[in-house]
């Protein structure tokens, strides 16, 4: 079992040693300056009060300095994500100092004990930063702490204890258990750095959540609602990763935050955007695709500092792998029914045709229920950049497509047996691109033919009349 540690966070090495060295104590936290992109390279170990390694290892006092802080570990080894992140930081910021905070001895414990050690590790990082601040040209404003899971709260403590204010802290799916709902001084919070951005990827809304659910930064980003990440479903982990265990599924979702951050470093040309929204349900309904008043932002490394915001919840959809970027669209569809068939819940699909590419058949997800004789809002997203939208095809799935729909059809028939021929009228669809903020209105090809029934399709083209909205491009997208 792990070696005991003292209250000052020092690890007593009480192993097989000669008497003379029996009292030797070692710091429980090590700082490894990664001097090479080669993951096998041993790097340089820095320690407070010893300036020689800074010179020997070419520590750049004027450059950005990243501290990567791992979380709880069951194996006691650095996991594979770590050298991926180191490499990505070196690729993006060639002159930067990349320091790995090795607190493995204190993290390789029971989870509760590891949690109790976070404060001591935060203190160690703060002491290192205080010492570096004594050096000429070193600025705390250039320091970026990146903490994964439990490491995010370690970063919070470090930011809290340091003399001055750290430039930035990024929390990568900060740990939930023992941190959810606690006082701001005992977890990551916006007060811990000049800018605190957080990615939440495994926040279950029921039971024990591995990642913290509550917002803890200036901006808190919840990719895919912050819970079920594409590519991490049970079928995915059995199929593509061939992991096949619940723990690997958990790991996949929890670790996704790291990969989203790495993606933001290495795929600069494909930045992912998140949109401010009060909750995941509203986002899924397509209500929150606005970039006005700083309501959207890049995610990960490219996030723009928003000091005025606190605990601002932001959402986006992603792909299952790198590059994670998708293209979001809000569809506003006015559905009219002469039959007043209130229980009609059609299974609708849309295909978008663009100047660059065409989308797949995209489902219009009904988050609550479709309101008839009203405007319904939907969110759809594509993995490819379609370019300018030219036309679209709306399809109402027929009875034969699925057992679920067969049941729906049967239920609808029971509720209104006198009127089995259900029909909806849709004259136009208003589309807004989340990424470009452009709005376009599409009308049915033939104004006299705007009805659709199960198993049928309806084509829409850019409106020729005054329904076409002005093209508005947010200046935000130029920041990408």
């Amino acid at each position: 079992s792990p070696v005991p540690f003292g209250p000052e966070g020092r690890l007593e090495d009480k192993l097989h040693k000669p008497k003379a060295t029996q009292t030797e104590v070692k710091p429980s936290v090590r700082f490894n300056l990664r001097t090479s992109k080669d993951p096998e390279h041993e790097g340089c170990y820095l320690s407070v009060g010893h300036s020689q390694p800074l010179e020997d290892c070419s520590f750049n006092m004027t450059a950005k300095t990243f501290f990567i802080i791992h979380g709880w570990t069951m194996s006691g080894i650095f996991e594979n994500w770590l050298h991926k992140l180191v490499s990505a930081l070196h690729t993006r910021e060639k002159d930067a100092n990349v320091v790995v905070v090795d607190w493995l001895p204190l993290a390789h414990q029971l989870y509760t004990d590891a949690v109790n050690n976070t404060r001591v590790v935060g203190h160690s990082i703060a002491r290192m930063l205080d010492w570096l601040q004594e050096k000429d040209d070193f600025s705390l404003g250039n320091v970026h702490l990146i903490g994964y899971s439990l490491g995010a709260h370690v970063a919070g403590y470090a930011g809290n204890f340091v003399k001055g204010t750290v430039g930035r802290i990024t929390g990568l799916d900060p740990a939930g258990p023992m941190f959810e709902g606690v006082d701001i001084n005992r977890r990551l919070s916006p007060d811990d750095a000049d800018f605190v951005d957080v990615l939440h990827t495994y926040t279950l809304s029921f039971g024990l959540s591995i990642g913290i659910r509550m917002p803890v930064g200036h901006i808190d980003i919840y990719p895919n609602g912050g819970d079920f990440q594409p590519g991490c479903g049970f079928n995915d982990v059995i199929g593509s990763f061939a992991y096949g265990t619940i723990s690997e599924m958990v790991k996949c979702e929890h670790e996704r935050a790291v990969h989203l951050f790495v993606d933001s470093l290495v795929n600069q040309d494909k930045p992912s955007f998140a949109f401010q929204c009060t909750d995941s349900s509203r986002f899924k309904r397509g209500i929150c695709l606005s970039c006005r008043k700083n309501r959207c932002n890049n995610i990960g490394y490219n996030a723009k500092k928003m000091r005025k915001k606190r605990n601002s919840k932001m959402y986006l959809k992603t792909r299952a792998g790198m590059p994670f970027k998708v293209y979001h669209y809000q569809l506003k569809v006015h559905m009219f029914s002469y039959n007043n068939s209130g229980d009609t819940q059609p299974t609708l699909y849309i295909t978008l045709y663009g100047s660059n590419a065409d989308s797949q058949n995209l489902p219009l997800e009904i988050v609550e229920k479709i309101e008839l004789n009203a405007t319904n809002t939907f969110l759809v997203y594509t993995e490819e950049d379609l370019g300018d939208l030219l036309k679209m095809r709306l399809t109402w799935e027929g009875v034969a497509h699925s057992w679920y729909n067969l049941w729906n059809e049967f239920r609808n028939y029971l509720s209104q047996p006198s009127n089995p021929s259900r029909e909806l009228y849709i004259r136009r669809i208003r589309v807004k691109s989340g990424e470009t903020q452009r709005k376009v209105t599409f009308c049915t090809q033939d104004p006299t033919k705007s009805s659709i029934s199960p198993g049928q399709e309806l084509w829409f083209h850019k409106c020729q009349d005054g329904w076409k909205m002005k093209n508005k491009t947010s200046p935000f997208v130029n920041l990408a």
């Epitope: 009480k14 080669d38 080894i77 001895p105």
Partner: antibody, heavy 120, light 112 residues
Amino acid sequence: QIQLVQSGPELKKPGETVKISCKASGYTFTNYGMNWVKQAPGKGLKWMGWINTYSGVPTYTDDFKGRFAFSLETSASTAFLQINNLKNEDTATYFCARFSYYGRHYFDYWGQGTTLTVSS
Amino acid sequence: DIVLTQSPASLAVSLGQRATISCKASQSVDYDGDSYMHWYQQKPGQPPKLLIYAASNLESGIPARFSGSGSGTDFTLNIHPVEEEDAATYYCQQTNDDPPWTFGGGTKLEIK
């Protein structure tokens, strides 16, 4: 140059204890983890576990929990494998091998091996 | 635990010909574009020696006639052209994230 030098062959009786050493040179001992690998006569390689040479925390695989103990003498850059209550099936060659903490955890340098024979 | 199955258990190859050894994992050993599969050579009375790391990277000092390929669950070690000194037992090993790390059963290569 980097070297891992292990102690010489051992002949033991069942129930006894053996302690095998692995002395490292040519690199900073505490900057790399140390593995132990067992190879029974005419058989393949079996990973026993590893020890964090900085913290001294050992990790054992399920088959090697109980009678086996990894330890260190950091000042002498030496790792130890101790096997208590020896059994006939412990007869094997034992290798130490280092790996990088930060990389892909392959074993880049190996000791020459220590042959242990357990026989009554 | 990830089980590695090597085939064939033994093979005899003529001098100058190609030797191909396969290693199949019970589940993927890939991680974010990297394969955590490594190959070792062991001669009688000697410790194993690292040949290939991360599926296809040649360890320094190893002759270029050794090459590795594969991803996911299927990996291959190729030796071409085979030389006399290549007679040995070859092992694959996976180190994908959390231990236990495991070795394949080994393939004995004889030179005809």
